[in-house]
């Protein structure tokens, strides 16, 4: 059997680090057998059998000129094997980032913090840690580790399915190359990394007879699971065409009546979502939808849909502590927003 341990990587390749001493091993001989070493295609003897180094070639302070293929021969001139030297660096700890678009699953992406120049792979796993009691800082013993399944096609991403919202997870991403391994451990709380996808299906419609009103409606993002106790809240922004500044409101449900639109001008509207108890962060903005208030006379009867805003509400603090979640609350899709709205309107 070969005296040369096979490093992870393609066969016949051995590895070293620039600026360091590198030992090459002749694969086709018995350990300790004296051999002669040559560069492939060059007749010059690099190291003779009388070096006292047996089946190994030592290159002091290797640099890029030492990379390439080497040939070792036994005393009788037989081929002991060919070895390709590739220089690079041991892995550095990768950088890891995790995000969740819902409260049941999260994904982690990673990227090398330093390019090693060598064949590299990543091992991904996670453990779950659960807090023992609301006031206790103690944690139960970690459970796991479990593999974090990586995306096919080599994308630097893995996904944890069926995560628990209240649990803390420790993600392990280990970068491995032939010169070693280096691990990044990242503690992840689903609450802190939660960022919903933007709301979908945004529509902006005029309100017949009200030249300063627009009605916007939207739906939950498709990625948000339909559970009654994890709701989203929304933030809506609107502005007339060619106007640089957005006005912001926080609607009570899945629609909003804008009462201070500029008559006759098209308006851009966009909407963002966030966990209703302020876990995580606001989603990105939805694609803009456009609408123009209607022209015409005001009807005698005042419609009651939508909560009417004359000034934006204050945005809640991102870091404010979240109150306990209610155990049961109807899903917003099941609520008729109009039923609970105060039946008051301001004439435009």
């Amino acid at each position: 059997s070969s005296p040369c341990p096979q490093a992870w990587g393609p066969p016949g390749v051995q590895y070293g680090q620039p600026g360091r001493s590198v030992k090459l091993c002749c694969p086709g001989v018995t350990a300790g057998d004296p051999v002669s070493w040559f560069r492939d295609g060059e007749p010059k003897l690099l190291q003779g059998p009388d070096s006292g180094l047996g089946h190994e070639l030592v290159l002091a302070q290797a640099d890029s000129t030492d990379e390439g293929t080497y040939i070792c021969q036994t005393l009788d001139g037989a081929l002991g094997g060919t070895v390709t030297l590739q220089l690079g660096y041991p892995p550095a700890r990768p950088v890891v980032s995790c995000q969740a678009a819902d409260y049941e699953n999260f994904s982690c992406t990673w990227s090398p913090s330093q390019i090693s120049g060598l064949p590299t792979r990543y091992l991904t796993s996670y453990r779950k840690k659960t807090v023992l009691g609301a006031d206790s800082q103690r944690r139960s013993p970690s459970t796991g580790p479990w593999p974090c399944p990586q995306d096919p096609l080599g994308a630097a991403r893995c996904v944890v399915h069926g995560a628990e919202f209240w649990s803390q997870y420790r993600i392990n991403v280990t970068e491995v190359n032939p010169l070693g391994a280096s691990t990044r451990l990242l503690d992840v709380s689903l609450q802190s990394i939660l960022r919903p996808d933007p709301p979908q299906g945004l529509r902006v419609e005029s309100v017949p007879g009200y030249p300063r009103r627009l009605r916007a409606s939207w739906t939950y993002p498709a990625s948000w699971p339909c559970q009654p106790h994890f709701l989203l809240k929304f933030r809506l922004q609107y502005r007339p065409a060619q106007h640089p500044a957005w006005s912001t409101v926080e609607p009570a449900g899945l629609e909003e009546v804008i009462t201070d639109a500029v008559a006759g001008l098209p308006h851009a509207v966009r909407v963002s979502a966030r966990d209703f108890l302020d876990a995580g962060t606001w989603s990105t903005w939805s694609p803009e939808a456009w609408g123009t208030p209607s022209t015409g006379t005001i009807p005698k009867e005042i419609p009651a849909w939508g909560q009417l805003h004359t000034q934006p509400e204050v945005e809640p603090q991102v870091d404010s502590p979240a109150p306990p979640r209610p155990s049961l609350q109807p899903h917003p899709r099941l609520l008729d927003h109009r039923d609970s709205v105060e039946q008051v309107a301001v004439l435009a």
């Epitope: 550095a92 950088v95 890891v96 992406t109 990227s111």
Partner: antibody, heavy 118, light 107 residues
């Protein structure tokens, strides 16, 4: 010669913008994570932002999140810091620094002074 | 974020003295601690990486030790050119943080 050279600093009004650049030479820029660190006059060092070699992951200090953007152009061996909505407390010397790895800085530029004042 | 504290904030010592600076992390950072030297008007310079490893080209009178939360930086024999401010810095977290610095001068 292995070096980093910052540019783009200067005097700007509160709410204004600046773009800092850091030109790298003498090493394989595209192999290393790069970082911006700042130092307010008479104060200590504060990490601002870092970016991985491929540029696909970045990290920011809470004090600049949402206002500053780090980027790199490996074909030009250059690191950037786009600074928007500048505040008086952003006044500092801004240093560009190189890895190894993420969070260790074995090569620093000489710094460029950013002054935010009306 | 991980907080770093350093003591003392400043010190005066004689040439040839042994100087010790301590650094404490608010949580376990393993050995992911660096020490930097910054002379007035200059950029910082990495002296010690990963708690105890001497950066290439740095004189052997500088050394570091410790792991977990408590770390020590030592100048075995203070030289006039060592007048500077010394910073510890953790990189266990992906958001690195520096200590407030220790100013060293000659008596």
């Amino acid at each position: 010669e292995v070096q980093l050279l910052e540019s783009g600093g200067g005097l700007v009004q509160p709410g204004g913008s600046l773009r800092l650049s850091c030109a790298a030479s003498g090493f394989t820029f595209s192999f290393y994570s790069m970082t911006w660190v700042r130092q307010a006059p008479g104060k200590g060092l504060e990490w601002v932002s870092s970016i991985v070699p491929y540029g696909d992951l970045t990290q920011y200090a809470d004090s600049v999140k949402g206002r500053f953007t780090i980027s790199r152009d490996n074909s030009k061996n250059t690191l950037y810091l786009q600074m928007n909505s500048l505040r008086a407390e952003d006044t500092a010397v801004y240093y560009c620094a190189k890895g190894p790895g993420w969070g260790s800085f074995d090569l620093w530029g000489r710094g460029t002074l950013v002054t935010v004042s009306s | 974020d991980i907080q770093m504290t350093q003591s003392p904030s400043s010190l005066s010592a004689s040439v040839g003295d042994r100087v010790t600076i301590t650094c404490q992390a608010s949580q376990d950072i393993n050995n992911y601690l660096n020490w930097y030297q910054q002379k007035p008007g200059k950029a910082p310079k990495l002296l010690i990486y990963d708690a105890s490893n001497l950066q290439t080209g740095v004189p052997s009178r500088f050394s570091g030790s410790g792991s977990g939360t408590d770390f020590t930086f030592t100048i075995s024999s203070l030289q006039p050119e060592d007048i500077a401010t010394y910073y510890c810095q953790q990189h266990e977290s992906q958001s690195p943080t520096f200590g407030p610095g220790t100013k060293v001068d000659i008596k």
